[in-house]
């Protein structure tokens, strides 16, 4: 009688299961008591001798490529050996590498966690993932693992992390890069500083007073609100960052506390109050303002 080793599938892909069957045509194992054993090169596989003519291999890897055969032994100790079967495990090259971010969209708050997720649509076996910063490519980290995705983490993002990033994946068929992903670090506004600017040292009624509010840090656009005794005077926008000014034609009622607020959608900050007082100099007919 002949004995055959049948591998199904016969040309497995890395990571996929394979069933080895030790087949004796025209003879059911129930027709006679047989023990079966499967071998790779010179090593027995699985449980060794068993009454089952099948052996399940949960996942085949490139290093499992080799020469396989099986043996069947009757109760009378006669051993049949199959021909050797070469099983070549096929490695799928990496393809369609992409870089995604968490949070999505590449916008992250300063101090928050940023994760750069490198993924491949296809690829088997040990895949090496590498992350690079900048179009020139400063290597940040590399990881080798048997999965289609890998992560690089920046636990607390700084302003200097705002850059373009890309990743590369490779499993023995040459490197495959992702596209560039831009990271924007969103910075909440700092506490703004309010400055009062008058055309002269002693501003008079009907002079134009400039209220200048500026937050030294914060991602644009920044919206500034101006207040007199907590009553809104108006707002000004700074689309590219920096400060903004609000002009006021002075009257006697403009004495009191002034403040401003900066808001860029990531939080609002209020300035310290600046007090503006009218003073009446001796012998002068007109009122003057001092701050």
């Amino acid at each position: 009688a002949e004995l055959f080793l049948i591998a199904s599938p016969s040309h497995p892909t890395e990571g996929s299961p394979v069933t080895l069957t030790c087949k004796m045509p025209f003879l059911q194992s129930s027709d006679a008591q047989f023990q079966f054993c499967f071998f790779r090169d010179t090593r027995a596989l699985g449980p060794g001798w068993s009454s089952s003519p099948k052996l399940q291999i949960a996942a085949m890897w490139k290093e499992d490529t080799g020469s396989y055969w099986c043996e069947a032994q009757t109760m009378a100790s006669k051993v049949l050996r199959s021909r050797r079967s070469q099983i070549n495990v096929h490695r799928v090259p990496v393809a369609d590498v992409s870089l995604e971010t968490q949070p999505p969209g590449g916008q992250v708050m300063e101090g928050d966690r940023l994760v750069l997720i490198c993924s491949v649509a296809m690829g088997t076996g040990d895949i090496t993932f590498l992350w690079y910063k900048g179009a020139v490519g400063l290597n940040l980290q590399s990881k080798t693992q048997r999965s289609l995705t890998a992560e690089y983490e920046i636990p607390s993002v700084r302003e200097s992390d705002a850059e373009q990033y890309y990743c590369v994946a490779e499993n023995g068929y040459g490197p495959s890069p992702s596209g560039l992903v831009s990271i924007t670090v969103r910075i909440p506004v700092s506490r703004p500083i309010l400055m009062l600017r008058a055309p002269r040292a002693q501003a008079a009624v009907e002079d134009v007073l400039e209220l200048h509010c500026e937050a030294l840090r914060g991602s644009p656009p920044i919206l500034y609100w101006f207040y007199h005794e907590d009553i809104t005077l108006g707002s000004r926008s700074a689309p590219s960052g920096g400060g903004a000014s609000f002009n006021l034609s002075l009257t006697e009622e403009h004495s009191g506390n002034y403040s401003c607020e900066a808001n860029n959608g990531l939080g609002a900050q209020r300035s310290e109050a600046v007090t503006l007082n009218f003073t009446v100099p001796t012998g002068a007919r007109s009122n003057h303002l001092t701050s």
């Epitope: 002949e2 055959f4 087949k23 045509p25 025209f26 003879l27 021909r83």
Partner: antibody
């Protein structure tokens, strides 16, 4: 493309021996996973497996016909043959040769040849 | 010996309808070693399904096989005119290969 072709006399006298040959083209009969079999079909009836052979010469027969059947192989000619002795009218049938890997399902068949047993 | 019994003996249906052919074994078929063949008049049988449910090369996906143990089914989801023929099941799990007696699928 694998092809199998049966040949032999279409008429055999009762009690004599039926002899058929199957010529294989498009593949070697010595391919080490294939068995080569004979199947017959009486007119208007179903299919009956007669037996099979491996290129090494190992044979496997239907127990109901075993005492009258001999299947042999000639690897040099890429042929295998069937001999069925002591035929009767019940042996009148279309005889097919076919290939089956590991002795499993028949995936390639000849077109069949009708053998009539006359009394 | 595993005896295969096919039912019905004849099935009369119209094109476009669904056909269900049954093959029952007298004992469990080893490792699901069961195949289905189609035979048209004057032609050799043609392999359609093997290993219970795997379609042979070139067989349209309207043909499907299912079952295990002793009960097996060939289903033709939507009959085409060329599907009307005789269908045989075959088991190859032991020392004796056997065929069913066939189901004739005819146009109603």
């Amino acid at each position: 493309q694998l092809q199998l072709q049966e040949s032999g006399p279409g008429l055999v006298k009762a009690s004599e021996t039926l002899s058929l040959t199957c010529t294989v083209s498009g593949d070697s009969i010595s391919s080490n996973t294939f068995y080569w079999g004979w199947i017959r079909q009486p007119p208007g009836k179903g299919l009956e497996w007669i037996g099979s052979i491996y290129y090494s010469g190992s044979t496997y027969y239907n127990p109901s016909l075993k005492s009258r059947v001999t299947i042999s192989v000639d690897t040099s000619k890429n042929q295998f043959s069937l001999k069925l002795s002591s035929v009767t009218a019940a042996d009148t049938a279309v005889y097919y040769c076919a290939r089956h890997e590991y002795g499993d399902f028949f995936d390639y068949w000849g077109q069949g040849t009708l053998v009539t047993v006359s009394s | 010996e595993i005896v295969l019994t096919q039912s019905p003996g004849t099935l009369s249906l119209s094109p476009g309808e669904r056909a269900t052919l049954s093959c029952r074994a007298s004992q469990s078929v080893s490792s699901n070693y069961l195949a289905w063949f189609q035979q048209r008049p004057g032609q050799a049988p043609r392999l359609f399904i093997y290993g219970v449910s795997s379609r042979a090369t070139g067989i349209p996906d309207r043909f499907s096989g299912s079952g295990s143990g002793t009960d097996f089914t060939l289903t033709i989801s939507r009959l085409e005119p060329e599907d009307f023929a005789v269908y045989y099941c075959q088991q190859y799990g032991g020392s004796l290969i056997t065929f069913g007696q066939g189901t004739r699928l005819e146009i109603k």
